[in-house]
């Protein structure tokens, strides 16, 4: 999906209003210095591409974040404010239902969500030069 045509300001507002709090809740009990940010993004469409990938694509050691509250809200925000996003996700959702696993918070998942927090912070500051 090409995130170029999303309403970035609305997605930012959704993040600041509620998604950010859910990410903090997920990470509660973890020191903010515990994980190094290794994933970065260069502009808002790129940030949303990376956010979608980290949130919804299973990775080694973290089978699924998709059922977490922050993930459901992220998916909803993209569906509302990125035209045509929902249509591209129908097949992906059906595939995900087939391989749904029980929710387990592993250290790898905590690290992944820490990376997500960094991507969201970067998304909210699009005019900053890449370090």
């Amino acid at each position: 999906y090409d995130f170029t045509n999303c309403d970035f300001e609305k997605i930012k507002a959704a993040y600041l209003s509620t998604i950010s709090k859910d990410l903090i809740t997920y990470m509660s009990g973890t020191k903010s210095t515990e994980f190094n940010n290794t994933v970065s993004c260069s502009n808002r469409p790129h940030c949303l591409t990376e956010i979608q990938s980290l949130t919804f694509n299973p990775t080694a050691g973290c089978a699924s974040l998709a059922k977490e509250m922050f993930a459901m809200k992220t998916k909803a925000a993209l569906a509302i404010w990125c035209p045509g996003y929902s249509e591209t996700q129908i097949n992906a959702t059906q595939a995900m239902k087939k391989r749904r696993k029980r929710k387990v918070t592993t250290n790898k998942c905590l690290e992944q969500v820490s990376q997500l927090q960094g991507l969201w912070r970067r998304f909210n500051r699009p005019l900053l030069k890449q370090q």
Partner: nanobody, 132 residues
Framework: QVQLVESGGGLVQAGGSLRLSCAAS????????ITWFRQAPGKEREGVAY????????YYADSVKGRFTISSDNAKNTVYLQMDSLKPEDTAVYYC?????????????????????????WGQGTQVTVSS
């Protein structure tokens, strides 16, 4: 240009009823979500009730569930808030607000409808005072 005009506020005794109206113009009403917010002195603006003019889906704040009813007349481009069993704590300025994309994505909007930062257009507000 876009306009939202609220009316129907006033002074009412506890246990009484009021019906607020929000008349909209300047945009495609059927595509929009309209939400009633309220703001009491010294408090944050609070989402009260949401309606999608696209499919009629509604959401309510827990504090008003069972007492307030939101409805829409698409032919008149007007949204109503019927407020029954009013309490002194319902005293506030009531605003209606409109947002374009949440109207056609009502199920996804369950997470976001009550956040004022997401709305594009606002009315000037109408005062509701509930005396004990």
């Amino acid at each position: 240009q876009v306009q939202l005009v609220e009316s129907g506020g006033g002074l009412v005794q506890a246990g009484g009823s009021l019906r607020l109206s929000c008349a909209a113009s300047g945009f495609t009403f059927d595509d929009y979500a309209i939400t009633w917010f309220r703001q009491a002195p010294g408090k944050e603006r609070e989402g009260v009730a949401y309606i999608s003019n696209s499919d009629g889906m509604t959401y309510y704040a827990d504090s008003v569930k069972g007492r307030f009813t939101i409805s829409s007349d698409n032919a008149k481009n007007t949204v109503y808030l019927q407020m029954d069993s009013l309490k002194p704590e319902d005293t506030a300025v009531y605003y209606c607000a409109a947002e374009g994309r949440m109207g056609t994505h009502s199920r996804d909007s369950v997470y976001f409808w009550a956040f004022s930062a997401l709305y594009d257009y606002w009315g000037q507000g109408t005062q509701v005072t509930v005396s004990s």
